[in-house]
């Protein structure tokens, strides 16, 4: 760092005050020298290191006609918004001739209400739930004491004497309002106000109370929601495709969900209209006049099968002699499952009626006993799915064939003898 | 006699741009701040911002930050302000001020002791 | 950024009277405060800087005071040329901010 030397006189007749200040003071510190000749630089040292970018100006008024006669410097060093990084030891350099100059000291010091760090934020938490609240603050001077306000109220009898830096708070069953003052020796500042919302706790114990094909029925335990009311809960349902892969806790689905209200008590709802033998995802969170609570985890829930809605489509029956030949198409309406097969029933007028399993085929060539001279003989169809049979189709009659029409030439089926079923 | 002068201003668009400048005389600029202050019709005083035109360091008010440019030109003795993506609530008398330079060691803040005639943006 | 508040935001006077004229900062401003002048279609001019320190060229009747947060501008016996409007000024700290004015008209 540049010294000043005694050997000859100062140049200096104005040295650097001082200036003692809060944070984001405006301040100007200024020396003065009588030179003669030519006026040199003025340079700013802090503790003696060299400001390379300090913001000074510099005048120059020459105090006679001849440029060798003597002249007065100011140079001016502006502090446009004090921090601590300023604060030091200020000193004017110049060097004339082989010489360096510097000035007496001038100190900048920091000093006021104390400045906050770091200030309690607004959050939400659940009722009863704990949590901690942060503060921190610095001088100078020093020390800093802190204390903290619920709802405007002290929760220490002085400063320093509760909890510092991190207010742990065991739960509130209101919302309430947080702030911490910081004492120095300068005086008091206050911290801003954080809000904090009390919400509903995340519903419990979320599970299937009954399953229908196209109908689930839920039921969960309610949180604590401190001094409010719950208004209402909100159930939502997504289907479990293998894409939206939605994960326990996932804050929010990729898709729009199904969305149901349900007002309180009971703590019950039933979701219609759902697709049978479905895997869904459900999940429920509950509201008070403070806001929402947290959703629960997605519960994987899934519909039942349920028996196909249809008949089977377009059947078709026509008799050759001794055979009858029968195909159909699977039903229109929905399965409501997975199809397992066929059954199939068959009758003449005097005659009890045949039920065979046709299995997933859908066609079938029936012998027909004696010489096939049983008269009305009829046939109907359902479709069955592990949950249980479909409607029967209306019987259809068995049609003489007619030589032309097509007949595609079908595995022989032996008619069994299966106990008689009326009709649907 | 120290003087300032400012001149440059005018009707403009929303959007455009203006230059406006502030001669000094009867004092050097580099010696000093010199500020930007607007009056808007029938309003009161507000800060544009500084430049120090020994360094060319300049401020800025916040309403103005990242449109407004402050120059200085030490061998012209003249500062200027350039004004882009002029707005409608810009519009207000321009004035720049020198300012106060006390013969103290140090002070805390400012005052402006000398004034433009204004020009009328 | 610090609020100046000045009051009365205007007064009538006589030629002769006493004005008092305060302005109260938002925050301590030590006594970084001045005041000025301005008169219809003219540049404000400079009073009192540094809260009580008058200006070079200033009428003695002008004075100023105050530190912290409470300012006053006094001019101690109104003359004809003193109707104008006075602002205040902080500078403690960057942005400098402005009162709103104190019209002072003839009763």
């Known amino acids: 760092a540049p010294r000043g030397t005694q050997a000859e006189e100062s140049p200096f007749v104005g040295n650097p005050g001082n200036i003692t200040g809060a944070r984001g003071l405006t301040g100007t510190l200024r020396c003065q020298l009588q030179v003669q000749g030519e006026p040199p630089e003025v340079h700013w040292l802090r503790d003696g290191q060299i400001l390379e970018l300090a913001d000074s100006t510099q005048t120059q008024v020459p105090l006679g006609e001849d440029e060798q006669d003597d002249w007065i410097v100011v140079s001016q060093l502006r502090i446009a918004s004090l921090q601590l990084s300023d604060a030091g030891q200020y000193q004017c350099l110049v060097f004339l001739g082989h010489q360096n100059f510097v000035s007496q000291p001038g100190y900048v010091g920091l000093e006021g209400l104390p400045y906050f760090l770091e200030e309690p934020e607004d959050r939400t938490v659940a009722a009863n739930t704990p949590f901690n609240l942060s503060c921190q603050a610095q001088g100078p001077p020093e020390p800093v004491d802190l204390l903290w306000l619920q709802d405007a109220v002290p929760l220490a009898t002085a400063p320093g004497h509760g909890p510092q830096r991190n207010l742990h708070v065991p739960g509130l069953n209101k919302t309430s309002s947080f702030s911490c003052e910081a004492h120095n020796a300068k005086g008091v500042t206050t911290s801003r106000t954080a809000t904090i919302t009390v919400l509903p706790q995340q519903p419990r114990n979320l599970h299937l109370v009954s399953r229908q094909p196209t109908e689930l029925e839920v039921a969960w335990t309610p949180g604590l929601s401190g001094i409010y009311p719950l208004t209402h809960c909100t159930l939502q349902a997504m289907l479990s495709d293998n894409e939206v892969g939605i994960q326990a806790g996932e804050p929010d689905p990729p898709e729009e969900p199904l969305t149901l209200q349900a007002s309180v008590p009971p703590h019950q709802l039933r979701l219609g209209s759902l697709h049978p033998h479905t895997p869904y995802h459900i999940r429920v969170a509950c509201t008070s006049s403070q806001g929402l609570s947290s959703w629960t985890h997605w519960l994987p829930v899934e519909t039942p099968e349920g028996v196909p809605l249809g008949p089977p489509e377009n059947i078709s029956a026509t008799r050759n002699g001794s055979q009858a030949f029968v195909h159909w198409q699977e039903p229109r309406a929905p399965l409501q499952g997975t199809l397992l097969g066929y059954r199939l029933a068959y009758q003449g007028q005097d005659t009890p009626e045949v039920l065979m399993d046709i299995g997933l085929r859908q066609e079938v060539t029936l012998e027909l006993q004696g010489d096939g001279s049983v008269s009305n003989l009829t046939v109907c169809v359902a479709a069955y799915t592990a949950a249980g049979d479909g409607p029967w189709s209306l019987p259809v009659p068995l049609e003489a064939w007619r030589p032309g029409q097509a007949q595609p030439v079908h595995q022989l089926v032996k008619e069994t003898s299966a106990p008689a079923f009326s009709w649907p | 006699e120290v003087q300032l002068v400012e001149s440059g201003g005018g009707l403009v668009q929303p959007g455009g741009s203006l230059r406006l400048s502030c001669a000094a005389s009867?004092?050097?600029?580099?010696?000093?701040?010199i500020h930007w202050v607007r009056q808007a019709p029938g309003k009161g005083l507000e800060w544009v911002g500084w430049i120090n035109p020994y360094r060319g360091y300049a401020y800025y008010a916040d309403s103005v930050k990242g449109r407004f440019t402050i120059s200085a030109d030490t061998s012209k003795n003249t500062a200027y302000l350039q004004m882009n993506s002029l707005r409608a609530e810009d519009t207000a008398v321009y004035y720049c001020?020198?300012?106060?330079?006390?013969?103290?060691?140090?002070?805390?803040?400012?005052?402006?002791?000398?004034w433009g005639q204004g020009t009328l943006v | 950024d610090i609020q100046m508040t000045q009051s009365p935001s205007s007064l009538s006077a006589s030629v002769g009277d006493r004005v008092t004229i305060t302005c109260r900062a938002s925050q301590d401003v030590s006594t970084a405060v001045a005041w000025y002048q301005q008169k219809p279609g003219k540049a404000p001019k400079l009073l009192i800087y540094?809260?009580?320190f008058l200006y070079s060229g200033v009428p003695s009747r002008f004075s100023g005071s105050g530190s912290g947060t409470d300012f006053t501008l006094t001019i101690s016996s109104l003359q004809p040329e003193d109707f104008a409007t006075y602002y205040c000024q902080q500078s403690y700290t960057t942005p400098p901010t402005f009162g709103q004015g104190t019209k002072v008209e003839i009763k």
């Open positions: 540094s809260a009580s």
């Open positions: 001020a020198r300012e106060y330079s006390g013969w103290g060691g140090s002070s805390v803040g400012y005052a402006m002791d000398y």
């Open positions: 009867g004092f050097s600029l580099s010696g000093s701040w």
